[in-house]
Interface confidence: low
C-alpha cells in the first residue's frame, strides 16, 4: 500500500520538511502532490511526468517545493501556513490511481520569554503576586520554575490562563525566587531571565549571639543581634532597660561583675512598622556554675489509689535553671492526671492510680550544668473493694 511519511513530523519554522513516499508502484506514468486531504486541481503543488522527467508547478506552488524521481517532495523554508495535510496521487500504468495522504506541523522558533508581575515588592502574609509569561503564542506549553525546580504542589500556587499566569497567594519570605518561565513547543524551548521578588517581612524575633550566658571578668563582651527582616532591621540595645546605642553589635571591653544583667536587642522594620525584642541574661563570673542538688518533697508518700492526690515539689536555690521530672526513667508528665505548675517546680497527680507507684526524681539544669535530686518513693494503697451500690457499709 502506498504511504507517505513526513520527515520530520514537527518542523521548525524556516526549516525544511521531506514528504517521503513508501511502496511506490513500479509501473507509473506520473504523480502529483496536492495541498489538503484530497485531490483538488486548484491546490496542486507540482506534477511529475516520469517519461519526460519533467516537473510542472501547480497553482499551489510557492517555489519552495522540489519533487524527486522517487515521488518524495521537499518543502524548504516552511512557514506556519504550510502546516496541514498533503496528498500524493500516483497514476499507475494500469491507469488505476492510488492516493496517500500525510501531514506535518510547523511550529515557530520561540522567542525568549519575559515575566511581567503585578507586584514586585509584596508584603509577607498579606499580598498576592501574579506573574505572567509573555508573549502569548499558539500551540505553546508554559512551564514555571522556582529556584531552578519545577513547581511544587502547594495550595498557595495557582496556575491559570493556560498556565501562562502563576499566582502566589499570600507570599512568604521564602517566595523570593528566582522565578523563570519556559515556553515550549515540539521544536523549540526558551526560558526567560530570572525574576526575583523583593518580599518585605519581619523583623522576626531577634537572635543574640553568641549564645554564651557566662563570661569571665576581664573578658570582652561582644554581642551581635540579628533579626530576619527585609528591608534589614534597625537595631538598638538596652542594658537593664536603659538605652545604650543604635547598632547591630554591642561591644563592652574588660567586663566586670557589674556588667551582669539583662541585655535587650530591639529590632525595627521601618517599612512593615513591626518591632521585636529579645532579652539575654549575661552573667559575669569566674566560676563555671554548678547547679546544686535539688530537694524533692511529697505532700504524702503513701496514698490511696483512685482517691487521693499528691503534690511533689522540687526545691532549689539556684536561679536561671529549668526543672524536669522523671518517673521510672521516663520523662513526665506522662498522663492527663499529671500536671506541672509553678515553673515545673510542682508535679501534681490527681487522682493517684496504681501505676503511679514508684520512684520519682527531679532534675535541675542550666545550659552548662545539671543535677538530680535523690529519688522519692510513692506508695499507692487500695482500700477494700467498693460496694456494688457505691455506698460504704454501715
Amino acid at each position: 500500500q502506498l504511504t507517505t511519511e513526513s520527515m520530520p513530523f514537527n518542523v521548525a519554522e524556516g526549516k525544511e520538511v521531506l514528504l517521503l513516499v513508501h511502496n511506490l508502484p513500479q509501473q507509473l506514468f506520473g504523480y502529483s502532490w496536492y495541498k489538503g486531504e484530497r485531490v483538488d486541481g486548484n491546490r496542486q503543488i507540482v506534477g511529475y511526468a516520469i517519461g519526460t522527467q519533467q516537473a510542472t508547478p501547480g497553482p499551489a506552488n510557492s517555489g519552495r517545493e522540489t519533487i524527486y524521481p522517487n515521488a518524495s517532495l521537499l518543502i524548504q523554508n516552511v512557514t506556519q501556513n504550510d502546516t496541514g495535510f498533503y496528498t500524493l496521487q500516483v497514476i499507475k500504468s494500469d491507469l488505476v490511481n492510488e492516493e496517500a495522504t500525510g501531514q506535518f506541523h510547523v511550529y515557530p522558533e520561540l522567542p525568549k520569554p519575559s515575566i511581567s508581575s503585578n507586584n514586585s515588592n509584596p508584603v509577607e502574609d498579606k499580598d498576592a503576586v501574579a506573574f505572567t509569561c509573555e508573549p502569548e503564542t499558539q500551540d505553546t506549553t508554559y512551564l514555571w520554575w522556582i529556584n531552578n525546580q519545577s513547581l511544587p504542589v502547594s495550595p498557595r500556587l495557582q496556575l491559570s490562563n493556560g498556565n501562562r499566569t502563576l499566582t502566589l497567594l499570600s507570599v512568604t519570605r521564602n517566595d523570593t525566587g528566582p522565578y523563570e518561565c519556559e515556553i515550549q513547543n515540539p521544536v523549540s524551548a526558551n526560558r526567560s531571565d530570572p525574576v526575583t521578588l523583593n518580599v518585605t517581612y519581619g523583623p522576626d524575633t531577634p537572635t543574640i549571639s553568641p549564645s554564651d550566658t557566662y563570661y569571665r571578668p576581664g573578658a570582652n563582651l561582644s554581642l551581635s543581634c540579628y533579626a530576619a527582616s527585609n528591608p534589614p532591621a534597625q537595631y538598638s540595645w538596652l542594658i537593664n532597660g536603659t538605652f545604650q546605642q543604635s547598632t547591630q553589635e554591642l561591644f563592652i571591653p574588660n567586663i566586670t561583675v557589674n556588667n551582669s544583667g539583662s541585655y535587650t536587642c530591639h529590632a525595627n522594620n521601618s517599612v512593615t512598622g513591626c518591632n521585636r525584642t529579645t532579652v539575654k541574661t549575661i552573667i559575669v563570673t569566674e566560676l563555671s556554675p554548678v547547679v546544686a542538688k535539688p530537694q524533692i518533697k511529697a505532700s504524702k508518700t503513701t496514698v490511696t489509689g483512685d482517691k487521693d492526690s499528691v503534690n511533689l515539689t522540687c526545691s532549689t536555690n539556684d536561679t536561671g535553671i529549668s526543672i524536669r521530672w522523671f518517673f521510672k526513667n521516663q520523662s513526665l508528665p506522662s498522663s492527663e492526671r499529671m500536671k506541672l505548675s509553678q515553673g515545673n517546680t510542682t508535679l501534681s497527680i490527681n487522682p493517684v492510680k496504681r501505676e503511679d507507684a514508684g520512684t520519682y526524681w527531679c532534675e535541675v539544669f542550666n545550659p552548662i550544668s545539671k543535677n538530680q535530686s535523690d529519688p522519692i518513693m510513692l506508695n499507692v494503697n487500695y482500700n477494700a473493694l467498693p460496694q456494688e451500690n457505691g455506698l460504704s457499709p454501715g
Epitope: R216, T285, E286, L287, S288, V290, K293, N329, E363, I368, S369, K370, N371, Q372
Partner: antibody
Amino acid sequence: EVQLLESGGGLVQPGGSLRLSCAASGFTFSNYAMSWVRQAPGKGLEWVSVISHGGGSIYYADSVKGRLTISRDNSKNTLYLQMNSLRAEDTAVYYCARDPTKGYAPTFDYWGQGTLVTVSS
Amino acid sequence: QSVLTQPPSASGTPGQRVTISCSGSSSNIGNNYVSWYQQLPGTAPKLLIYADSKRLSGVPDRFSGSKSGTSASLAISGLRSEDEADYYCGAWDGRLNGYVFGGGTKLTVLG
C-alpha cells in the same frame, strides 16, 4: 606542639607532703581547664581534681578531699598539686591533663608523661 | 570499684571488629558526654573519642564511639596488632561532681 611535663614526684613517708608541678607549653594555658589523674601501679585511671581555666572553680575526688590541693599559676603556665597527709594508697603515677572544653563537656585531649609518687615507710 | 563498668578484657584477631562496652547511670553517661582513651603499655593515656562519637583529629576511622541511654561503646574495626592496649571510658558525674573512669578493658590481639 602541646606539651605537658610533670615533675616533683618521688618517695615520701606516710603522713608526708609533696608538691607536683606540671609545666605547660605550646598552647594558651590560661584558656584551658586542667586536671590531675592518677594511676596506681597495675590499676586503672582515677581522676583526682580539676581546676577551671581561671582557677576559681575547683573539684576533688572524694578520696583526696582535704588532703590534696590543686592550683595554677597562669603567668607561669604551670599547674600544681599540693599533697599533704599522704597515704600508701596515694602511691601512683600522677598525670596532668588538659580539658579543651573548659569543663562544659569534660574530656582530656593532652596528657603529660606522668610522675611517680611512692608513699612508703 | 569503678563508677563506670567495663569488661576487664576483650580479644580479637587481626582484621576483626571488637566492641568494648561501658555502663553507667543517668548521673554520668545518661546526661553527660562520654570519652574513650587508649593507653599503650608504659605510656600515658591518649584520647580517641570525645562527645560520645567524635573522633579526635588523627585518630583512624577504624575507631568509633556510640551511646544509648546510660551505656556507651567503643568499636574497633579492622583490628591491628598495634591496637593491643588498655581502653578506658570516662564521663563527668553530676552527682559526684567529678570525672569518673571505667575500670579499663585490656584488649588482646590474638595470633
